[in-house]
Structures are given as C-alpha cells and as structure tokens.
C-alpha cells in the first residue's frame, strides 16, 4: 500500500481467482482514543470500532472511502484505490492501446517545435467517474523539471457502437534549449483513475523524436505565362524554431487529381517554392519536416488548381 | 582555399556540402547496424546515449545561432579553449566565434575518427565478420576534416592488448553511431546557419 | 468546484410519492459515493440513503422498502425515489457528493437542499 495523495491510498494486488488479497490497517487521524467507528462510503453499516481499523481488501467491493467517527461527528477519511496486477502485468483497462507506432502505445506525444513544449493525449471509451494527474521529467535518475497543465476533455468520437473520448495535456520543459542534443529523455507519467480502479502508464522520448510541425502557411499558386506551370510558394508555420537558417525544414509538394486512384506528382524541395503542372480540378498539397533529422512530416496544407 | 565572398550557393561555403554528406553517411550506416544487429539492444530506446565528446569540446555552445544567445538556458558553458581560424568561411566573414565553433566541429570529428577507426580494427578481428565501418562514412569524415583545415595534433589511434569482447564492441558501435548521427545534425544545422549568414 | 443543484421537493399528502434529483456539475472527477440526506427543523442532519460508485446502495432502517436510491452516471444525476411519504419524512433533504479529482485530491460537495413536506 502506498499513498497517491494526502489521504488517498493504493492498495497494489495479484488479481487472480481467491487470490489472499492484502491486509490493511486504518488509523484514524485524531488525538481522540475512545468511542471511535468506521463506516464506507457513506453507508450507515459500521464496520469496526477504535482507532484502527484491519481489513482484507481482496476485490472492489473493498475498496472506497473509509470514515472513523465520533459521535456523530467526521474525524479523517481513507480513501483506498485497487491497482490489479494479472500475471505479473499491471491492468491497463482505463486506457485504449493506440497501436501507434507499436503495440502498447497508450500515450502518444507530439512537439510543434524544439522549444521543450509538447502536447500527449490518451483515448478511453469511458465516459464518467474518470480522473487523470499528469507528471513529467528530463531524466528519471536526477530528474530535471517539465511542466504540465491539467488534463482536459479534447474531442470525443462516435467509432462504430462506441463512444471514444480523448484526453490532452500540454507540458514545456522548464529550461529547454531549442539547439541542444538531447542525451536524457523525456518521461511522462500519467495517473488514472476509474471509480477505484489506480492504473499507471508512462511514456519515455526525445523531443527530437516526437517533432511534427505544422503545415506550411499562405500557400500560394503564381500561374506562369504561356504555360500549364505554375510558381507554388508558402512559407515556414509560424511556429517552428527560429532561426530557420538553422532550424530548416524540407519540403514535399504533390499534385493529387480529383480522383484518389489518380496518379500523384511528387516533388521534394529545400526551397519555400516549386514549379509544377497544374492539371484541371487537381489541387496542390505541400507538407513539411525536419531537413536534417526526419521525425514525422507535417499534415498537408492544400490549395485547388483552378 | 579561401573562396571569394561573390561566389553563388553552394560555392560560397563548401563546407555545407561536405556536413550534408556526413548527415546521409552516418544516418546510412546507423540504419546499416540497427539492420544487421537487430538483436543487439542498438534502438535509440534501447542504448545508452553517451557523448565522448563531452567536456572535451562544446559545439553546441561554441555554435549557437546569435538569435539562441538571447535564450538562458542555451548559454551553461560559452567558454573553449579553441581559438583557431579555420578556411571555410571567406576569411572577411569569420568571426572570432565561428572561428571556434568550426575549430570545435574539428575536433569532434577528429575524436569520434579515432573511435570509428579504433572499433572497426577490433570488428574486423570478428569471426562473424558481421558489421564493418562503412569506408564512404570514414572517407566523407576526412573529406569535411580537410575542408575545415584546422591544424591540430594528431590524435594516435587507440590500441588494446587484451582479446576484444565483440559483443560489447557492436553495442558501443551503436552507441557511437547514435551520438554522432546526432552531432551530425547539429554539425548540419550550423552549416546551413553560417551558409545564410 | 463541484457544484450541486437539488430539485423535485413539494408539499404531497401522506402515501404520496415525490423524486428527488440532484445533479452535479464542475470537474467531478471520480465519484467515491453520494449521499441523500435530511434534516427536520431543531434536529441534526441525518443519512437517507446512499449509493458508492460500484452501484451498491445502502438505507436508513426508517425508509428501507419505500426508498430507493439510483445514479444515472451519464447524466451525473443521482435519484432518491421516495413512495408511501409520512409525515415524519418532512425535512430539507441535501445531496451529497464525495469525489476524488487527482489534481486537487478528495473533495465533499453539498447541494443547497430542497424541502420535501408530507401534510394532509
């Protein structure tokens, strides 16, 4: 057992059929000796008296909010949390296996930039009863400071009979050099839970690693004369590193048809412009990506031909 | 060697093209290792990542771009102790810091040379003979040696009595192809920085 | 803050019925169990009925068989079905609402009340 927060406790248990369980002790937390009862979870039922309590917590039903009392009056409270260990694995219930980039991927993190400031979200098909604590760290030895916000509510999708609904956090790190080579990485560590159910996940990465940058901006078509070309220009988002001399970026402009079965023209380029063959009703995407380390390409910002 | 200032990209700085050949060498041969020892722990996940250069140079510092000095947490160590003049830059252009910054980018490259050619004597004594240093990464690493043209003392390539354990060798290749992939991208970056400046 | 808003209170005749509601809004977080409770003029307040978060509910001797307590989580609603109304269930009825929200920790929230009086 061990605590999660001021009066708020994680009862860690092998979860399998009549497993023994774990035995708790409970002490009120009052100078008071005598005339002390134990309830859970608001019920009138009592379950003990004195200023310790001894149970077996073996299933949820456990599990809850534990009050001593004194004469009608609240002394502490207790709440004990159940976290299932089946088959030498941690339970992972809460959370949806992404399966991106690999199985087991629970947490998925992304940075727009190299300025130490990255965003993860984590779906889950529950809808209430749910809470989440997010930490972060360069390092997990000699641990060195990230910063994150609250955990929100960021969209919620309809898949098939099911409702799945995803979660966010944004964190920065507190003292980042966007020029640095990174040697520690980044841990994330996100607490979850469900009713009385603890669970634990984590992520580990180099901002390096995680670098998406958002697409190009004010793209822009220049027809050329007595040609079917045109001039594409755009420019870097305005939220990548600077300065873009040293933070560059590489380019990737595609010509796509209406029809998806269309043949597509691809180009790659440096430079923050390109000439391509416009065809009728075709529309030209351009995305980018870290020049020097290739981490995840940008989503596509598109413009039509005509 | 010291090209005129009017001549066009990429002329101007020959060194850009040398680093971007450095980029596609290292990165080729990492992705040549990750291949051949996969079922060595030589994933970035899986290795621990060290720096031999550390505390010896400082060319993340000795290069920062003018626009990062302004950033506290960019500026831990701004002091090294080279302060040579190097010839890829036309010489009306180099400044005191570009100076050592590419007189710190030599000598990375002269430490992990040492290492690379340290590590592949020892693999090519391997049984297995199943991973060697790729020849155009060694090569390519001279080649941007050159065209910084630093003067420095020859640094004697390590060599050991005892029987080499090749196990722990292909690890630290993997260590050491990881580090310098990453100080290639750095080493890239700056290129590109100074070409504009 | 978790806020609750009590409502379905009224003046109904002995062997009458009334539901209660009570619903919560705010960042509610986990919810550990939820409570109804009452408290007649020049008494103290006294548990009802209550419900913890596996659903299991529990009752005061005096209502058990005419009280019933149910959740709908969807709606972050709680009920309090009250049938075969006496005289002696008069009182200002509050919800009660404990909670845990891991980035502040446990919280016990009450409603305003509603009052609920049974008179012929």
């Known amino acids: 057992i061990w605590e999660l927060k001021k009066d708020v406790y994680v009862v860690e248990l092998d979860w399998y059929p009549d497993a023994p369980g774990e035995m708790v002790v409970l002490t009120c937390d009052t100078p008071e000796e005598d005339g002390i009862t134990w309830t859970l979870d608001q019920s009138s039922e009592v379950l003990g008296s004195g200023k310790t309590l001894t149970i077996q917590v073996k299933e949820f039903g456990d599990a809850g909010q534990y009050t001593c009392h004194k004469g009608g009056e609240v002394l502490s409270h207790s709440l004990l949390l159940l976290h299932k260990k089946e088959d030498g694995i941690w339970s992972t219930d809460i959370l949806k296996d992404q399966k991106e980039p690999k199985n087991k991927t629970f947490l998925r993190c992304e940075a727009k930039n190299y300025s130490g400031r990255f965003t993860c979200w984590w779906l889950t098909t529950i809808s209430t009863d749910l809470t989440f604590s997010v930490k972060s760290s360069r390092g997990s030895s000699d641990p060195q400071g990230v910063t994150c916000g609250a955990a929100t509510l960021s969209a919620e999708r309809v898949r098939g009979d099911n409702k799945e609904y995803e979660y966010s956090v944004e964190c920065q790190e507190d003292s980042a050099c966007p020029a640095a080579e990174e040697s520690l990485p980044i841990e994330v560590m996100v607490d979850a839970v469900h009713k009385l159910k603890y669970e634990n996940y984590t992520s580990s990465f180099f901002i390096r690693d995680i670098i998406k940058p958002d697409p190009p901006k004010n793209l822009q078509l220049k027809p050329l004369k007595n040609s079917r070309q045109v001039e594409v220009s755009w420019e870097y988002p305005d939220t990548w590193s600077t300065p873009h001399s040293y933070f560059s970026l590489t380019f990737c402009v595609q010509v796509q048809g209406k029809s998806k079965r269309e043949k597509k023209d691809r180009v790659f380029t440096d430079k923050t412009s390109a000439t391509v063959i416009c065809r009728k009703n075709a529309s030209i995407s351009v995305r980018a990506q870290d020049r020097y380390y290739s981490s995840s390409w940008s989503e596509w910002a598109s413009v039509p031909c005509s | 060697r010291n090209l005129p200032v009017a001549t066009p990209d990429p002329g101007m700085f020959p060194c850009l093209h040398h680093s971007q050949n450095l980029l596609r060498a290292v990165s080729n041969m990492l992705q040549k290792a990750r291949q051949t020892l996969e079922f060595y722990p030589c994933t970035s996940e899986e290795i621990d990542h060290e720096d031999i250069t550390k505390d010896k140079t400082s060319t993340v510092e000795a290069c920062l771009p003018l626009e990062l000095t302004k950033n506290e947490s960019c500026l831990n160590s701004r002091e090294t102790s080279f302060i040579t003049n190097g010839s890829c830059l036309a010489s009306r252009k180099t400044s005191f810091m570009m100076a050592l910054c590419l007189s710190s980018i030599y000598e990375d490259l002269k430490m992990y040379q040492v290492e690379f050619k340290t590590m592949n004597a020892k693999l090519l004594m391997d049984p297995k003979r199943q991973i060697f240093l790729d020849q155009n990464m060694l090569a390519v690493i001279d080649e941007l040696m050159q065209a910084l043209n630093f003067n420095s003392e020859t640094v004697p390539q390590k060599s050991s009595l005892e029987e080499p354990d090749f196990y722990k060798t292909k690890i630290k290749l993997c260590i050491l192809l990881h580090a310098f992939r990453i100080r290639a991208v750095t080493i890239d970056r700056v290129m590109s920085y100074l070409n504009a400046s | 803050e978790v806020q609750l808003v009590e409502s379905g209170g009224g003046l109904v005749q002995p062997g009458g019925s009334l539901r209660l509601s009570c619903v919560a809004s705010?960042?509610?977080?986990?919810?550990?169990?939820t409570g109804w409770y009452r408290q007649a003029p020049g008494k103290q307040r006294d548990l009802v009925a209550s419900i913890n978060s596996g659903g299991r509910p529990n009752y005061q001797d005096s209502v058990k068989g005419r009280f019933t307590i149910s959740r709908d989580s969807a709606k972050n609603t709680v009920y309090l079905q009250m049938n075969s109304l006496k005289p002696e269930d008069t009182a200002v009825y509050y919800c009660?609402?404990?909670?845990?929200?891991?980035?502040?920790?446990?919280?016990?929230?009450w409603g305003q009340g509603t009052q609920v009086t049974v008179s012929s």
């Open positions: 009660n609402l404990r909670g845990l929200v891991l980035s502040t920790g446990l919280y016990e929230s």
């Open positions: 705010g960042d509610i977080g986990s919810m550990t169990s």
